[in-house]
Every structure is written in C-alpha cells, then in structure tokens.
C-alpha cells in the first residue's frame, strides 16, 4: 500500500493510474467504501463523502489514463486509505494528514518559550525534528518546546516530519520581539547633550503599548521613575516625565530619549521596559550613563568620572604629547601642582579611548581656562 | 553618613515671614538635591520646592509660587528655604530631603513635586494662625 503524507491546509494530489491510455471508467472510495468520486463518460460524479466539496480530479489528465483524486483543504481527519477502482483493479493510498502549529502566536517576547504542536491522525506515531534559523536543532514527538527564545531565533523554523519513511515539511515563521540591543553604555563629558536609543528589532504594522524608564542614579539609593509613556500605531505620547533631567522623547519610532546635559548626578543605569499590547510580559533594553569632570582647584587638577564604569577601565591625566603623569583603574585622579599646558583626561579600555576631556592648566599666577 | 537637620520653625500670624534652614552633614549640599516637603495633620505629606545639585534648578509647588524661596549655601552647608506672605494653611511640619535629582514631574502641562526622596530629617512644624 502506497503512503502519501500531506499537511493540513494544503492541497494533496493521489495518483491512480490505468494501463489504458484513454478514459475509461474509474472511482475513488474511502475505507469505509463510500464513494467520493468518479466519471461517467467525460463527466466528473462526486459521491456521498464529507469530501464532497473539497474532492476533484483532472479532467485533462483521463485521457492518458491517469485518475487522480485531489484533496483540497486538507484536515488531519482526511486521514485515511483511499481506493481506485479502475480496469477491475484496486489501487490503495494511505494518506496521512499532518498539522503542526505555535503554541499561540508566531509573535513571542524575548526570553519566552516556543512550543510547537503536531497534530497527527491516531494510529500514527511519527517524530520531528525542527531546524531554528541559527541551526540549531530540536526533537520530539506530539510536543516540541524551546524555552528563553533569542533574537536570533526570529525567522523561519524548518521543520521535517517522519512517518514511515516518508517525511513531510513545515515552515513557520516566528517573530521574536526584542530590543536590538539589550544593553548599552554612553560616555559623556560634563554639559555635553545625551542621546539614548532604543531601536526594536522587529517591524509590525501597528505597534501598541505602553513603557517606562527607571533610572538608578549611582549617587541616589534607589531607582526612579523618570518617563511613562503610551506607544499607538508607533506614535509616542508622554504620560508623566521628570524635570530634573529634563528629559525629552522623539515622537517617532525608534524610541529615543534625550537628555540636555551630562551631569554627575544623573550618571547611572536605567532600564526601559515596553509593555505590548495584547502581550503578557515586557521588552526590556538597559542604558548606562557614564560622566568625565575635569577641574582645577587651586594647585590641585583633578579628573572624576560617575557611573557603572567596569574594574578594567584606567583613568589617566596627560599633559598633551606627554607620558601619563597618572593612570589608575579608580574613578578619580589628580595631580598637585600641575604645570602649564593642555592636559587631557582619559578613560580608557585596554588602550582604546572611551571618553576624553581637555583642561587648559594656565601658568600659577591666573585662572584656569576650560575649553 | 548622610544626615539633614531642619530649624527655624515656629509660629507666625498670617502674612509673616519664616526661613527654614537645612543643615546637611555627611556630603556637600551641591553634590545632591534637596527638597523641603511638607505635612499638615491629618493629611499627605506633599512637596514644597526643591534646588537641584550642580545647576542649581528651582522648582515650586504651585500653592507657594512667588511667595517662597528655595537656596544654597555651599560654604554653609545648608539650604534654605524662605517663606513670605504665609497662610494658615501653610501650618504644617517641614521636612528637607535629599536625592540625586528632584522628584519634579509634569504630565501634559500639569507639574507637580512628588515626595520619593533617599533621605529625610525629623521635621520643624511652622504655625501660622492669628
């Protein structure tokens, strides 16, 4: 018995052939020997079956004594051995119908569990395996779950089922919803302007929600509130924002965020939590805020830096062109009596500079000048 | 270790003056902000006005708008906070408090001073009553 494995949905095309070139007399039962169709000459009959109107064939086809029958629409419950009755033979087809659908949407928040169900008809017992689009692979039976999706795991999911020996395939895309970046750091000078983003990593049509960012500040005990707002069709609206930065929000997608000047007081971690509409749970995207103050007091120059700076990083004073006259991984240097020139302040990891402030140091009987 | 003592409290008849001062110890008055708050019995404490660290911002309720003052003295280590043309229902307890930032807000074109602040005095009650 020939076995034929199709995908709920789809179109399935059972072949049955006759020795004859011509058109001849021919039927398609069920196992239960209800006719589903036939010809009577050059005209199509369709019986009594639930396939009634979804049941055809290939009028063009008969003449070189080929006789399909084609099953649109299929439903796992189409599962089942169809006959061909043609030339007092019988030919038998097993059709095996096969569903395979997300747990509840193909639109998943990061860090949620992806479950893939098989629908199968009883009596079978097939297994499958699904390919995700950074390759890697998953097993199972009726059930398959990939619990904390990535990013990388938006796109199409390939997945093959086995049932003997013939194997069918499904493609489903998933849609992870996330911020492209889950973290990011800014480094600032004093008085210089801030700008945070917070690109998605997904496009939908209609975008709907509502977020907020908490700011730890590093010299304040606990988090804040800072900015609340509503997300319609991907237009932003401010529900409730602080003064003291004050803060400002685009308009637009992508969200983004500006703070007129870097202060001490503001350096910091904040998080920006978006809740989607009609989504159980929260998109979250961290920003750090890092600040250089360079200043001379008296005979004493000296460089600070505020915020979650990593141990790694080395804090420098230079004269320009110079060696460093300090260099430490601490959040403060100075150097007493410094002489005349431009001094740079430098934050830097393994070498590489992450943020730079110029100081004029002027000869000891004037004031200091600062670019 | 941060700590804020309030004085200058005490009674006034209506349309008197006060100065509440904040004394601060354990940091520099500049490096934080800091907010009087106030709360008259039986009710929320609600917030007064607040002067932010490096730029010195101000910013007011608007019940005492044009008739209080808010002010820094770095050398001093204090704020103050300057109370004209007082009302009965200025009554109340003062407390200063200090944070990184001031808790001002505005929704829309409504801005408000709510009183989420890290650390707190024990308070000076102003009477102002006839």
């Known amino acids: 018995k020939k076995v034929v494995l199709g995908k709920k949905g789809d179109t399935v095309e059972l072949t049955c052939t006759a020795s004859q070139k011509k058109s001849i007399q021919f039927h398609w039962k069920n196992s239960n020997q209800i006719k589903i169709l036939g010809n009577q000459g050059s005209f199509l009959t369709k019986g009594p079956s639930k396939l009634n109107d979804r049941a055809d064939s290939r009028r063009s086809l008969w003449d070189q004594g080929n006789f399909p029958l084609i099953i649109k629409n299929l439903k796992i419950e189409d599962s089942d051995t169809y006959i061909c009755e043609v030339e007092d033979q019988k030919e038998e087809v097993q059709l095996l119908v096969f569903g395979l659908t997300a747990n509840s949407d193909t639109h998943l928040l990061q860090g949620q569990s992806l479950t893939l169900t098989l629908e199968s008809p009883p009596g079978s017992s097939p297994s499958v395996q699904c390919r995700s689009p950074r390759g890697k692979n998953i097993q199972g039976g009726k059930t398959l779950s990939v619990s904390q999706l990535e990013l990388q795991d938006s796109g199409t999911w390939t997945c093959t089922v086995l049932q003997n020996q013939k194997k069918v395939e499904f493609k489903i895309d998933i849609v992870v919803l996330a911020f492209q970046k889950a973290s990011s750091i800014v480094y600032k000078k004093e008085g210089e302007q801030v700008e945070f983003s917070f690109p998605l990593a997904f496009t939908v049509e209609k975008l709907t929600g509502s977020g907020e960012l908490w700011w730890q500040a590093e010299r304040a005990s606990s988090s804040k509130s800072w900015i609340t707002f509503d997300l319609k069709n991907k237009e932003v609206s401010v529900k409730r924002v602080t003064q003291d930065p004050k803060l400002q929000m685009g308009k637009k997608l992508p969200l983004h965020l500006t703070l007129p000047q870097a202060l001490p007081q503001y350096a910091g971690s904040g998080n920006l939590t978006l809740a989607l509409e009609a989504k159980t749970g929260k998109l979250h995207q961290e920003v750090n805020l890092v600040v250089m103050r360079a200043t001379q007091l008296q005979k004493n120059l000296t460089c600070e830096v505020w915020g979650p700076t990593s141990p790694k990083l080395m804090l420098s004073l230079k004269l320009e062109n110079k060696e460093a006259k300090v260099s430490k991984r601490e959040k403060a240097v100075w150097v007493l009596n410094p002489e005349a020139g431009m001094w740079q302040c430098l934050l830097s990891d393994s070498g590489q500079v992450l943020l730079e402030s110029n100081i004029k140091v002027l000869p000891t009987w004037s004031t200091p000048v600062q670019p | 270790e941060v700590q804020l003592v309030e004085s200058g409290g005490g009674s006034v008849q209506p349309g008197g003056s006060l100065r509440l001062s904040c004394g601060a110890s354990?940091?520099?008055?500049?490096?934080?902000?800091i907010g009087w708050f106030r709360q008259a019995p039986g009710k929320e404490r609600e917030g007064v006005s607040c002067?932010?660290?490096?730029?010195?911002?101000?910013y007011y309720a608007d019940s005492v708008k044009g008739r209080f003052t808010i002010s820094r003295d770095n050398a001093k280590n204090t704020v103050y906070l300057q109370m004209n043309s007082l009302k009965p229902e200025d009554t109340a307890v003062y407390y200063c408090?200090?944070?990184?930032?001031?808790?001002?807000?505005?929704?829309?074109?409504?801005?408000?001073?709510?009183?989420?602040?890290?650390?707190w005095g024990e308070g000076t009650l102003v009477t102002v009553s006839s």
């Open positions: 408090a200090a944070d990184a930032t001031c808790p001002y807000y505005c929704s829309g074109s409504v801005c408000y001073l709510e009183t989420g602040m890290d650390y």
């Open positions: 354990g940091f520099d008055v500049d490096y934080y902000a």
């Open positions: 002067i932010a660290s490096s730029d010195g911002s101000t």
